[in-house]
């Protein structure tokens, strides 16, 4: 059976998501990313709130955060373009693109991944799969390798009773079930992929996880689908 | 190095309050959850609660629910837990725990008068 | 809650001996943590997720189980493995220690 990883999850294949990435602070992880183009990363903006004096770097191609593996390459930051709106005390436009040092050397087990640019919602009850290397369990437990989970799309009205996020989710966020299957600390930043295409971006507002009446929240990507493009370009 | 520095031992009286810090250094203590728990001579180990660091969430054993009260301050990377109401019950060794992983060297309470 | 029973609650064994405990949960359980305590000492996280060894521990133990019933198994004894051992479960809530087994060396 499925033990404590992500919440609810278990140990993904090695190198089966070539796009994900940890984005990392003075050589720890801190949250997770997801590589859309060859030398850009998408993240969460509030990852960086507490980074002001640290080294940020991004690593690729990494199913262990120690173990040594070929595919696995730290890239240096030389720009971290958060979205224009984002503010520390909203979960709204939590988004950050990181350029990397260099376009990253692409292979099997680092590829970018495609980013849904339709902007409709997904539909309630599709299954989509966030991975990551956030705590696994309610010990606090952060694992090695990287950990995924598949959770269902809960619709808009459901998320915002005022017993789950009290109307606090806008058209541009989405959310996914929690109930004791969940996204968690260190998996913001992280991909939700619905269908192989990039749909959400795990928010870093302090949630609590595993909890079915607080589900988890993702920016849609294709919501910001100017922004990105205006970034990349 | 990860660590957990724990404040001294405290010798109350009945009825006092007592308030218990512990300091981590080598990490942020706002990246995991921090546990308190609670040691008795004959008596093993039992789980107080915990907090979530990053927002202040905490969790705790229904028992402990009204007796203790769990909070941390990120910005000097301690948590504190107090303890309210003391009887002889209290008498314990506390340990704080990151993740439960790492642990603090304890911190002594003695209840009497 | 979920009441974990540790079994045996004292036992003794010889360097070298193999040595198994069990903790059997109320209901059942995902997974179980092990916690070594030697006197005067703050526990040890042993073993993590059932089976998992935690950094440092050696891996002449090992732990095992599903269910309800869960072991912790050092396979050759040694005069540091005495000490009380702890099992703990984050499955369900309020997250519960067992009573511990105290291990003595003969």
């Known amino acids: 059976p499925p033990r404590g990883r992500i919440l609810g999850g278990r140990e993904a294949e090695a190198h089966a998501r070539p796009y994900m990435a940890s984005v990392q602070l003075n050589g720890a992880h801190l949250c997770g990313g997801v590589l859309v183009a060859e030398q850009w990363v998408l993240s969460a903006a509030h990852c960086l709130e507490d980074a002001a004096d640290g080294k940020v770097q991004v690593l690729l191609g990494a199913h262990s955060l120690s173990q040594p593996e070929p595919s696995k390459r730290l890239y240096d930051v030389l720009r971290a373009v958060p979205h224009p709106d984002s503010q520390p005390d909203t979960i709204d436009h939590d988004l950050l693109l990181l350029q990397l040092s260099e376009k990253a050397t692409l292979g099997p087990a680092v590829r970018p991944l495609p980013w849904q640019r339709v902007d409709r919602d997904v539909a309630p009850g599709t299954l989509c799969d966030v991975a990551g290397w956030g705590i696994v369990n309610h010990a606090g437990r952060r694992p090695d390798s990287l950990q995924h989970v598949l959770l269902p799309v809960l619709d808009r009205a459901t998320c915002n009773r005022r017993t789950h996020h009290d109307g606090a989710i806008t058209e541009r966020l989405m959310c996914a079930e929690s109930n004791r299957r969940d996204s968690c600390k260190g998996d913001s930043g992280g991909p939700l992929v619905c269908g192989g295409v990039l749909e959400g971006v795990v928010t870093s507002g302090s949630r609590v996880c595993g909890n079915r009446k607080k589900p988890g929240i993702y920016t849609r990507v294709a919501s910001y689908a100017a922004w990105i493009d205006s970034v990349l370009a | 190095e990860v660590q957990l520095q724990q404040s001294g031992a405290e010798l109350v009286k009945p009825g006092a309050s007592v308030k218990l810090s512990c300091t981590a250094s080598?990490?942020?203590?706002?990246?995991?959850?921090m546990h308190w728990v609670k040691e008795r001579p004959e008596q093993g180990l039992e789980w107080i609660g915990r907090?979530?660091?990053?927002?202040?969430?905490?969790k705790y054993d229904p028992k402990f629910q009204g007796k203790a009260t769990i909070t941390a301050d990120t910005s000097s990377n301690t948590a504190y837990l107090q303890l309210s109401s003391l009887t002889s019950e209290d008498t314990a060794v506390y340990y704080c725990?990151?993740?439960?992983?790492?642990w603090g060297q304890g911190t002594s309470v003695t209840v009497s008068s | 809650q979920i009441i974990l029973t540790q079994s045996p609650a004292i036992m003794s064994a010889s360097p070298g001996e193999r040595v198994t405990m069990t903790c059997s949960a109320s209901?059942?359980?995902?997974?179980m943590y092990w916690y070594q305590q030697k006197p005067g000492s703050s526990p040890r996280l042993l073993i993590y997720?059932?089976?998992n060894l935690a950094s440092g521990v050696p891996l002449r133990f090992s732990g095992s189980g599903s269910g309800t019933s869960y072991s912790l198994t050092i396979s050759r004894m040694e005069a540091e493995d005495a000490a009380t051992y702890y099992c703990?479960?984050?499955?369900?809530?309020?997250?519960?220690f067992g009573g511990g087994t105290k291990l003595e060396i003969k």
């Open positions: 725990a990151n993740a439960m992983d790492y």
């Open positions: 080598g990490f942020k203590i706002k990246d995991t959850y």
């Open positions: 997720d059932t089976s």
């Open positions: 209901s059942s359980v995902s997974n």
């Open positions: 907090i979530d660091p990053a927002n202040g969430n905490t």
């Open positions: 703990q479960q984050w499955s369900s809530y309020p997250w519960t």
